[in-house]
């Protein structure tokens, strides 16, 4: 049987609290691949590091 979570695209996570429905990644998080059960926290560019690329729903920030 196919894992229902495999249908969740990048930018979402498979939400067990919502009956394995695909949910958008919450603020300050992302998922770069499909089928993820959690979204990763976005990198914070701090101190002398400046943000070269903002975190999106599918990719981490670049400092």
């Amino acid at each position: 049987l196919q894992d229902p979570c495999s249908n969740c695209p990048a930018g979402t996570f498979c939400d067990n609290n919502r009956n394995q429905i695909c949910s958008p990644c919450p603020p300050n998080s992302f998922s770069s691949a499909g089928g993820q059960r959690t979204c990763d926290i976005c990198r914070q560019c701090k101190g002398v590091f400046r943000t070269r690329k903002e975190c999106s729903s599918t990719s981490n920030a670049e400092c």
């Epitope: 958008p24 919450p26 603020p27 729903s57």
Partner: antibody, heavy 120, light 111 residues
């Protein structure tokens, strides 16, 4: 009854900052995300950003990065949106809107809107 | 980040059906089933009519329905009524750092 009550109209000079509040009632404040959307006179809706009232994490529209700050006060169930370095193009009605349960693709309840006028 | 594309205006006679389109890309409308539609009367806050492409919140008339094909989402209003005259906006989740984006809006006129 779910309600989002926003602060009153503001008139600001270019270069100044404005802080709009949105007080929530009738639901568990920390269980629902809050979006901020603005609408310039005669124009369409523009998404500005979102805040998680539970942890305080935020995501801002690229256009407003560095100029907008969204915060919350869980003790008063209030969300704030501060926009700095105001210019005339920021003249608009600013709305807060409750994200549907937990985190979803829609906003089911909206505040009444706060008119912000930027004029010298 | 440009807005999703909607027709500026759509009109119809009472009782007719009309459809409003909302065209995006595979990075927003086409990539996710997170499309919403809002109705806005002049001077009022927007009201949610459709979410997750085709779901209707309680209290919204069954005359309103949503669908999606490829990169285009659609809102259909059947049995058009005078009170349906308003502006309608689509909204979609997107892969960009601007997490959500709106269409430019469509003015619906009941003739």
């Amino acid at each position: 009854e779910v309600q989002l009550v926003q602060s009153g109209a503001e008139v600001k000079k270019p270069g100044a900052s404005v802080k709009v509040s949105c007080k929530a009632s009738g639901y568990t404040f920390t269980s629902y995300y809050t979006h901020w959307v603005r609408q310039a006179p005669g124009q369409g809706l523009e998404w500005m950003g979102i805040i998680n009232p539970s942890g305080g994490s935020t995501s801002y529209a690229q256009k407003f990065q560095g100029r907008v700050t969204m915060t919350r006060d869980t003790s008063t169930s209030t969300v704030y949106m501060e926009l700095s370095s105001l210019r005339s193009e920021d003249t608009a009605v600013y709305y807060c809107a409750r994200g549907a349960p937990e985190y979803s693709s829609s906003s089911d309840y909206w505040g009444q809107g706060t008119m912000v006028t930027v004029s010298s | 980040q440009s807005a999703l594309t909607q027709p500026a205006s759509v009109s119809g006679s009472p009782g007719q059906s009309i459809t409003i389109s909302c065209t995006g890309t595979s990075s927003d409308v086409g990539g996710y089933n997170f499309v919403s539609w809002y109705q806005q009367h002049p001077g009022k806050a927007p009201k949610l009519m459709i979410y997750d492409v085709s779901k209707r919140p309680s209290g919204v008339s069954t005359r309103f329905s949503g669908s999606k094909s490829g990169n285009t989402a659609s809102l259909t209003i059947s049995g058009l009524q005078a009170e349906d005259e308003a502006d309608y906006y689509c909204n979609s989740y997107t892969t960009s750092s601007t997490r959500w984006m709106f269409g430019g809006g469509t003015k619906v006129t009941v003739l």
